[in-house]
């Protein structure tokens, strides 16, 4: 004989478990239906009647099959230093990520809780490691023969121009000034054949590393505690 398909609610076999998209209801002592994403349990099952599911209200969601009595609240609106990369729907929470020029200083399960402005390297310093979505810019002092005259979160140290006759020698924060009409630019640092500048190294000053400008921070407050869960919201 073919095995009979059990319809919810039903009592599981002793030591058995409920099927996918079902949960064991302790009160009814039955396997009962979970609610699909975008819905929640409005009325719990009994021995004779199944779970009643209802749609999540505005600004609330459930992402998984669940039996929560209330949908979860979507996070607060994205702050001014963030962009909304996923809207709040009945099936998913709002996701806020940091806008260009900012990085995530404090992440959360999805998106970012706290964005901070990317560090700007001041003159005499260049970007050693560019910022990413989750890490700040790392600055380094410009090595002899290179300079940066900008306050920037993207500019690297660039080589001084090569002068036939130097009017003002370059330093870490200023390019060399030539008297000749046609200066040449040396190749990027790290190139295989990096020509030495015509002017002597003693003309370059290497500043001691100093902290870059403090990043501005902007806070995105965490979402309040979630509504009570009857158990795991997983399948």
């Amino acid at each position: 004989l073919p095995a009979q398909v059990a319809f919810t609610p039903y009592a599981p076999e002793p030591g058995g478990t409920c099927r996918l998209r079902e949960y064991y209801d302790q009160t009814a002592q039955m396997c009962c239906s979970k609610c699909p994403p975008g819905q929640h349990a409005k009325v719990f099952c009994t021995k004779t009647s199944d779970t009643v599911c209802d749609s999540c209200e505005d600004s609330t969601y459930t992402q998984l099959w669940n039996w929560v009595p209330e949908c979860l609240s979507c996070g607060s609106r994205c702050s001014s230093d963030q962009v909304e990369t996923q809207a709040c729907t009945r099936e998913q929470n709002r996701i806020c990520t940091c806008r260009p020029g900012w990085y995530c200083a404090l992440s959360k399960q999805e998106g970012c809780r706290l964005c901070a402005q990317l560090r700007k390297c001041r003159p005499g310093f260049g970007v050693a490691r560019p910022g990413t979505e989750t890490s700040d810019v790392v600055c380094k002092p410009c090595a002899p023969g290179t300079f940066s005259n900008t306050t920037s979160s993207t500019d690297i140290c660039r080589p001084h121009q090569i002068c036939h006759v130097v009017a003002i020698p370059g330093n870490a924060s200023m390019d060399a000034v030539c008297t000749s009409t046609s200066p040449t630019r040396s190749m990027a640092p790290g190139a295989v054949h990096l020509p030495q500048p015509v002017s002597t190294r003693s003309q370059h000053t290497q500043p001691t590393p100093a902290p870059s400008t403090a990043p501005g921070t902007s806070f995105l407050l965490p979402v309040g505690p979630s509504p009570p869960a009857e158990g795991s919201t997983g399948d």
């Epitope: 009160t27 349990a41 409005k42 009325v43 719990f44 009643v52 009595p69 209330e70 309040g224 505690p225 979630s226 509504p227 009570p228 009857e230």
Partner: antibody
Framework: QVQLQQSGPELVKPGASVTISCKAS????????IHWVKQRPGQGLEWIGW????????KYHEKFKGKAILTADTSSTTAYMQLNSLTSEDSAVYFC???????????WGQGTTLTVSS | DIQMTQTTSSLSASLGDRVTISCRAS??????LNWFQQKPDGTIKLLIY???RLHSGVPSRFSGSGSGTDYSLTISNLEQEDMATYFC?????????FGGGTKLEIK
């Protein structure tokens, strides 16, 4: 047997505050909502709000925001409702009730009579 | 807020009668309706939830029906202990609201 035992009657002066308690027993206190309901003499029932002791989330009827404050103490399995700036309009019987889902109250306390009078 | 109206504020019936108490919502409440019994001593009990589900321990002579905006509670074979006030309550939309009550007296 599930029980919700409420505190005794209160006689308070206008402008004062009062706290009513609701002691829960014989069930898992943190897995159920506790609701508070107002009943004025000879009138219907009014839902005030709920608290979920499991995570202390509260939800209030707009009308009672600022009037009622709901709290719960999981160690003593007791829910509390504080009523502030009392007037004669607050004279009523107040019930606590529990629910597993948010909307239907399966067990009720016996009620606490509050009289506001000078 | 959703208004719940119980047009009959009181009714009297004889023991053994079949009594129906009605409740109307100001908008569709999609069967999210409960019935409560309040005894003269003030104690309140849940009888029926979600229109027709009988709460555990409630005698089977109580039943509920309805849909949309119109709902009813039926007590068949009325008993003395059924003398009480009956309230309907919607839980479709916050805030949850109650009807004004129907007081049932025994003739």
């Amino acid at each position: 047997q599930v029980q919700l035992q409420q505190s005794g009657p209160e006689l308070v002066k206008p402008g004062a505050s009062v706290t009513i308690s609701c002691k829960a027993s014989d069930y898992s206190f943190t897995n159920y909502y506790i609701h508070w309901v107002k009943q004025r003499p000879g009138q219907g029932l009014e839902w005030i709000g709920w608290i979920y002791p499991g995570n202390v989330i509260t939800k209030y009827h707009e009308k009672f925001k600022g009037k009622a404050i709901l709290t719960a103490d999981t160690s003593s399995t007791t829910a509390y409702m504080q009523l502030n700036s009392l007037t004669s309009e607050d004279s009523a019987v107040y019930f606590c009730a529990r629910s597993r889902a948010t909307g239907y109250f399966d067990y009720w306390g016996q009620g606490t009579t509050l009289t506001v009078s000078s | 807020d959703i208004q719940m109206t119980q047009t009959t504020s009181s009714l009297s019936a004889s023991l053994g009668d079949r009594v129906t108490i009605s409740c109307r919502a100001s908008q569709d409440i999609r069967n999210y309706l409960n019935w409560f019994q309040q005894k003269p001593d003030g104690t309140i009990k849940l009888l029926i939830y979600y229109t027709s589900r009988l709460h555990s321990g409630v005698p089977s002579r109580f039943s509920g029906s309805g849909s949309g905006t119109d709902y009813s509670l039926t007590i068949s074979n009325l008993e003395q202990e059924d003398m009480a006030t009956y309230f309907c309550q919607q839980f479709n939309t916050l805030p949850w609201t109650f009807g004004g009550g129907t007081k049932l007296e025994i003739k």
